[in-house]
Interface confidence: low
């Protein structure tokens, strides 16, 4: 339905508060280096303009597209050339090339200072002094660091952030009330950002068909009682929402997401019995709740899949008539029967089925050719099952920190060219799969573990894409979305790697390590471990363990010393010499 003024339409649909918040998110995700005050000024100008269009949709410029309006506004930033370099060239382009140009310059790893949390009293004072600015600052800081954060979901985070301060700044023990809530929001926010990044990568790098396949599988697992036509409708709508958000169309995205939540709740009887509680919540909570809702129970007495997809004489006829629809039905039927499989496994099975039909439907006797197709699934199912079993056993034996270290060594040997901070970040996140998923019963382990690993490996892929250094990473990241994890799992030690020259500076530590949190201290040690492996890729587990144990003892000793700095200087030299000897450097 065409509107005379798109900006007026969205302003009316979303309301002023959400409109302003979403425009701020959009601008911060595009111009990640701009100061907060500059963005607030731009947002206020856009909002005032939108209000004139609401009053009179025929007013000058009100008929322009949102990309044109927003792009024109971003291109008024005076320091664009010196702050962003070649991104300023985007402003010479016309829409929609200009918007695509801005999208291509989004930086997954912007050079921004780490967010340091002020004292609780300082935060509470700032919150009380100017609540609106305080919350806008939160949106701005998250959006600029996470340029693909799912905008309507960020509004939900901001609502929880506000609620935490409203409650805790009145509490007797403000810190005890507030800090755990902020920690939870930070961790959930990072997870939410990474999950959305995978959705955008899926759409942008592998196309809409890949995303739709993922959505069919996931929604069929979640809503196994819904019929195929219903799942297809939800997939189409969900694809539109994520295409918009990933494309920077945040107002349309938030509006369409609200419409989708409304539709789901109005039709929950034909979708899922688990939606009742979600649908009683306010909009932001409702959308979040639906996105996280547990799988509905599988219908009783589902017939065998083989009847329609192997035994039927019409398989090739049905496939030829509407390939994607038939494959979609296969994926739907398989996924609703297998909540115990990861989405990526289901997609591998569907791909195998598609490849088999492509080959067999051209054969002399198609039925004879594809009769054993389900037998080809067995090794595909067993591979992740065995991998998860082995890794959960290792996790239970080592605990999270040492399990992360095992993965650090494993991945540094596979792709030693990758930067140390990236290897540490990715391996730490890979290692979290243990505490996240190994506690689950068998039936929930694979969807938890393998789909989580897909999210983490996508982080590696997007960070590596910015500065590609390893052909092996590029190959695993670009060849197949669903086979990324098996591709990385299959990598052996990179025999072509020339070990990094030893640099004592890398292993020089100071007394500041003693005041770090346990997490920060772990990261320091894990950074040293990666560097060790880069110097000595053929080092054995035992050698590395010995050096790391010495290192832990060294830090503990010097942090207890009276003159810490002298201890770090003197003992550090001894440690470096001993480590070199132990590793034969």
């Amino acid at each position: 339905d065409a509107h005379k003024s798109e900006v007026a339409h969205r302003f009316k649909d979303l309301g002023e508060e959400n409109f302003k918040a979403l425009v701020l998110i959009a601008f911060a995700q595009y111009l990640q280096q701009c100061p907060f005050e500059d963005h607030v000024k731009l947002v206020n100008e856009v909002t005032e303009f939108a209000k004139t269009c609401v009053a009179d949709e025929s007013a000058e410029n009100c008929d322009k597209s949102l990309h044109t309006l927003f792009g024109d506004k971003l291109c008024t930033v005076a320091t664009l050339r010196e702050t962003y370099g070649e991104m300023a060239d985007c402003c010479a382009k016309q829409e929609p090339e200009r918007n695509e140009c801005f999208l291509q310059h989004k930086d997954d790893n912007p050079n921004l200072p780490r967010l340091v949390r002020p004292e609780v009293d300082v935060m509470c004072t700032a919150f009380h002094d100017n609540e609106e600015t305080f919350l806008k600052k939160y949106l701005y800081e998250i959006a600029r660091r996470h340029p693909y954060f799912y905008a309507p979901e960020l509004l939900f985070f901001a609502k929880r952030y506000k609620a935490a301060f409203t409650e805790c700044c009145q509490a007797a023990d403000k810190a005890a009330c507030l800090l755990p809530k902020l920690d939870e929001l930070r961790d959930e926010g990072k997870a939410s950002s990474a999950k959305q990044r995978l959705k955008c990568a899926s759409l942008q790098k592998f196309g809409e068909r890949a995303f739709k396949a993922w959505a069919v599988a996931r929604l069929s697992q979640r809503f196994p009682k819904a019929e195929f036509a219903e799942v297809s409708k939800l997939v189409t709508d969900l694809t539109k929402v994520h295409t918009e958000c990933c494309h920077g169309d945040l107002l349309e995205c938030a509006d369409d997401r609200a419409d989708l939540a409304k539709y789901i709740c109005e039709n929950q009887d034909s979708i899922s019995s688990k939606l009742k509680e979600c649908c009683e919540k306010p909009l932001l909570e409702k959308s979040h709740c639906i996105a996280e809702v547990e799988n509905d129970e599988m219908p009783a007495d589902l017939p065998s899949l083989a009847a329609d997809f192997v035994e039927s004489k019409d398989v090739c006829k049905n496939y030829a008539e509407a390939k994607d629809v038939f494959l979609g039905m296969f994926l739907y039927e398989y996924a609703r029967r297998h909540p115990d499989y990861s989405v990526v496994l289901l997609l591998r099975l569907a791909k195998t089925y598609e490849t088999t039909l492509e080959k067999c439907c051209a054969a002399a006797d198609p039925h004879e050719c594809y009769a054993k197709v389900f037998d080809e699934f067995k090794p595909l199912v067993e591979e992740p099952q065995n991998l998860i079993k082995q890794n959960c056993e290792l996790f239970e034996q080592l605990g999270e920190y040492k399990f992360q270290n095992a993965l650090l060594v494993r991945y540094t040997k596979k792709v030693p060219q990758v930067s140390t901070p990236t290897l540490v970040e990715v391996s730490r996140n890979l290692g979290k799969v243990g505490s996240k998923c190994c506690k689950h019963p068998e039936a929930k382990r694979m969807p938890c573990a393998e789909d989580y690993l897909s999210v983490v490996l996508n982080q590696l892929c997007v960070l590596h894409e910015k500065t590609p250094v390893s052909d092996r990473v590029t190959k695993c990241c670009t060849e197949s979305l669903v086979n990324r994890r098996p591709c990385f799992s299959a990598l052996e030690v990179d025999e072509t790697y020339v070990p990094k020259e030893f640099n004592a500076e890398t292993f020089t530590f100071h007394a500041d390590i003693c005041t770090l949190s346990e997490k920060e201290r772990q990261i320091k040690k894990q950074t040293a471990l990666v560097e060790l492996v880069k110097h000595k890729p053929k080092a054995t587990k035992e050698q590395l363990k010995a050096v790391m144990d010495d290192f832990a003892a060294f830090v503990e000793k010097c942090c207890k010393a009276d003159d810490k700095e002298t201890c770090f200087a003197e003992e550090g030299k001894k440690l470096v010499a001993a480590s070199q000897a132990a590793l034969g450097l």
């Epitope: 829409e95 929609p96 090339e97 918007n99 695509e100 140009c101 999208l103 291509q104 759409l203 942008q204 592998f206 196309g207 809409e208 068909r209 890949a210 739709k212 694809t239 539109k240 295409t243 494309h247 509407a322 390939k323 994607d324 629809v325």
Partner: nanobody, 123 residues
């Protein structure tokens, strides 16, 4: 009313070149991904190439990679298909199609279709 009109088809010798054009009207051209599909006599319609609404992303079928190039001119509401090193197996009716959202997808994801233009590669 939305119209997609293909032109530029014809008879060409193996190894030769052709440039197909598709002029769109009745839609906001820059809001649509565009694609070319083809159908040889007695065969399924197959996806050849598609391009995103701003031209930033393209998809090519393996059979045409390195030989065919898709481009678009949003100011002229036109999408082009430059076909080089043509082979007899490229003989088909070529259809232009428009999709509201960028897809590398199948024909089901395209909303509007042209009538087609015939390309014959023969010596």
């Amino acid at each position: 009313e939305v119209q997609l009109v293909e032109s530029g088809g014809g008879v060409v010798q193996p190894g030769g070149s052709l440039r197909l054009s598709c002029a769109a009207s009745g839609l906001t051209f820059s809001s649509y991904a565009m694609g070319w599909f083809r159908q040889a006599p007695g065969k399924e319609r197959e996806r050849v190439v598609s391009i995103s609404r701003g031209g930033g992303y393209t998809y090519y079928a393996d059979s045409v990679k390195g030989r065919f190039t898709i481009s678009r001119d949003n100011s002229k509401n036109t999408v082009y298909l430059q076909m080089n090193s043509l082979r007899p197996e490229d003989t088909a009716t070529y259809y232009c199609a428009a999709a509201r959202y960028w897809a590398t997808g199948s024909e089901y994801e395209f909303d509007y279709w042209g009538q087609g233009t015939l390309v014959t590669v023969s010596s």
